[in-house]
């Protein structure tokens, strides 16, 4: 079942999925000047059986002979400033992602794909939050959010994370990180804001495959 809303927006933080639950869809978006091949699916779909999950359909982009008429949402100038680029040091290398049953790994890039990936998550998906560079995490609980369904409506749980302006960047789950005890801290209003926007992730994998560079855009 598709999550019909989006993971919460945490100020000075970005999120990512370590693996994608079966049923997750990824838009086949092409970069400017290219379009999806006519016979191509508009989505890649994480599917699987009891033993193996993989992405169905392969996105393919071809040069736009005629003027590209694909609908693109252009961020307004005030939205542009919400883009944040962060280097995320991660012990988890793309090549060594642990295979979770019923989950797909990050799909490999395809030729002439757009710089941003648009995922459609499903109920049961977990995403993990990390403070952007220059901010440190204060944890009150898990820095993660799970899409749940109640009474036919989907919602994401609120990650217990506050990012405070300090120099050391925090790490993704599974990595060493100093713990704070922020019990007395009030939750900021911004950390409570649930965005209703698709979360687009731009990834560039360094040659060493040890660094994720994310651009997150709230469109």
């Amino acid at each position: 079942e598709l999550c019909d809303d989006d993971p919460p927006k945490i100020t000075h933080a970005t999120f990512k999925a370590v693996a994608y639950k079966e049923g997750t869809m990824l838009n086949c978006e092409c970069k400017r000047g290219f379009r999806r091949i006519k016979s191509g699916s508009p989505y890649m779909l994480c599917t699987g059986n009891s033993s193996h999950s993989s992405w169905d359909n392969q996105c393919q982009c071809t040069s736009s002979a005629a003027r590209n008429t694909t609908k693109q949402v252009t961020p307004q100038p005030e939205e542009q400033k919400e883009r944040k680029t962060t280097e995320m040091q991660s012990q988890m290398q793309l090549a060594d992602q642990v295979s979770l049953p019923g989950h797909c790994r990050e799909p490999p890039p395809w030729e002439n794909e757009a710089t941003e990936r648009i995922y459609h998550f499903v109920v049961g998906q977990t995403v993990y939050y990390q403070c952007v560079q220059g901010y440190r995490a204060l944890h009150r609980g898990p820095a993660e959010s799970v899409c749940k369904m109640t009474h036919g409506k989907t919602r994401w749980t609120q990650p217990q994370l506050i990012c405070t302006g300090e120099t050391e960047p925090s790490q993704f789950p599974g990595e060493e990180e100093p713990q704070a005890s922020p019990d007395g801290l009030p939750e900021s209003e911004t950390s409570r804001l649930v965005t209703t926007t698709d979360f687009r992730i731009q990834t560039e994998v360094a040659a060493t495959m040890e660094t994720f560079i994310f651009t997150t855009e709230y469109q």
């Epitope: 036919g152 409506k153 209703t196 469109q219």
Partner: antibody, heavy 116, light 106 residues
Amino acid sequence: QVQLVQSGAEVKKPGSSVKVSCKASGYTFTSYRMHWVRQAPGQGLEWMGYIKPSRGYTEYNQKFKDKATITADESTNTAYMELSSLRSEDTAVYYCARGGGVFDYWGQGTLVTVSS
Amino acid sequence: DIQMTQSPSTLSASVGDRVTITCSASSSISYMHWYQQKPGKAPKLLIYTTSELASGVPARFSGSGSGTEFTLTISSLQPDDFATYYCHQRSTYPLTFGQGTKVEVK
């Protein structure tokens, strides 16, 4: 209480465009996606697409991506769907429906008739 | 796209009858949702997540099924139940509906 109120019936010429509105009240407009569903005369329901009102992100059924353009105005809590290059087969009732999961609230529908 | 096939397309029944409508999905889905529509009116949510009754829906309605086969049952048909019923999946885009089952007076 939650209400979705749509604009009135329209009669349009082939080749023209029409813009249907859906004014939401009784809930936080930006917290839910707004979906659009079409029903041709005597036919079933077809999902056309949705908009996320807070930023204007849209997702379309490929069948309608060149026909429909969905927009929203946060200041008036109104979603819109514009249909272009109208043809007789676009004659239908168009519904807006609140998302966030199942469609628990629907507009009353807007009949668009395309006739020369 | 996931195709949804309802059967029957039309069902003639009398008040008090037990009525069963089936919906088959072309691929396995997580849940089925059901809507009721009366002439000239917008659809109304009837059953969500396969078997949960929407607010205000009488207990004579029930839903069941899993995978690709789902069923809507009305245990004892009432005058207010003559309408068209649609199944709906939102497990994958594009979201799709069944073609509808019209329950009419026999």
